[in-house]
Amino acid sequence: AVNGTSQFTCFYNSRANISCVWSQDGALQDTSCQVHAWPDRRRWNQTCELLPVSQASWACNLILGAPDSQKLTTVDIVTLRVLCREGVRWRVMAIQDFKPFENLRLMAPISLQVVHVETHRCNISWEISQASHYFERHLEFEARTLSPGHTWEEAPLLTLKQKQEWICLETLTPDTQYEFQVRVKPLQGEFTTWSPWSQPLAFRTKPAALGKDT
């Protein structure tokens, strides 16, 4: 029987990707393992090779089709198995019945750009990537701004409780370099989590006009 504690966690990006992490205490680092996806109501199945990401955890991405294709729906259940090679046979190490729309993690927002910048404010827009049309407007965002001399962890979180792909940052300091990030989360799904943070967007506020009060 399998020994040690295991964890097998997967998320669906809402379109054509299931990303999985498997961790197993005491597992051999050089063992060949894979994740196998077996849908309950579709003709395809898919496999990905688990690659080490740390001493006792492995990760892989199940690519189900073209990035923007809708490969699964809210009624699908996909049985996911971790299989590891043991001599000449494959051994099942972990198994779960995966409900894709209960375990969502979208791709990080993309195409961040400064729409307009002034001395004290900056308007920024972004786009969501590979997000299902099923969500319609049922998404929320978190944003954060990195100020000089601070860390991302210290940055206060700004919450946008609707599908709003822009923000107007205010009370900024003139002639100052900032960075901005945003992430997205569907409202649907018991185990749904935030997307990764977007790539940071660097911008600089305009200098204050000479002789004017700031």
Epitope: S6, R91, I95, D97
Partner: nanobody
Framework: EVQLVESGGGLVQPGGSLRLSCAIS????????IGWVRQAPGKQREGVSC????????FYADSVKGRFTISKDNAKSTVYLQMTNLKPDDTAVYYC??????????????????WGLGTQVTVSS
């Protein structure tokens, strides 16, 4: 080799209750994901309930949620399926099954490594 022996089946009226037992020998209960799978005449095997190895998470088919409860007694190496408010649709042979892995599956019963011989449950007036 793990052996599974079911008991507790029988004839019961609609709305009645039964408790199925599955005694496990040849292995420790904590080492396996355990499932109850049923097969009605002329139908495919259907996962009813299962319990994940090590973290004891429990899962139920929508058709039995709120009526059936899976539990285990490590000291007795036995898994139970408490069935209440039974319906004629619950009539089937009930099998206990085990998988040598973390987790369990209701959707794909063929993933189980070890099977009992089954116990008949008949719900009829």
């Amino acid at each position: 080799e793990v052996q599974l022996v079911e008991s507790g089946g029988g004839l019961v009226q609609p709305g009645g209750s039964l408790r199925l037992s599955c005694a496990i020998s040849g292995g420790t209960l904590d080492s396996y994901g355990i499932g109850w799978v049923r097969q009605a005449p002329g139908k495919q095997r259907e996962g009813v309930s299962c319990m994940s190895r090590s973290d004891d998470r429990t899962f139920y088919a929508d058709s039995v949620k709120g009526r059936f409860t899976i539990s285990k007694d490590n000291a007795k190496s036995t898994v139970y399926l408490q069935m209440t408010n039974l319906k004629p649709d619950d009539t089937a042979v009930y099998y206990c099954a085990a998988v040598d892995a973390y987790g369990c599956s209701l959707v794909q019963p063929t993933t189980y490594d070890f099977w009992g011989l089954g116990t008949q449950v008949t719900v009829s007036s």
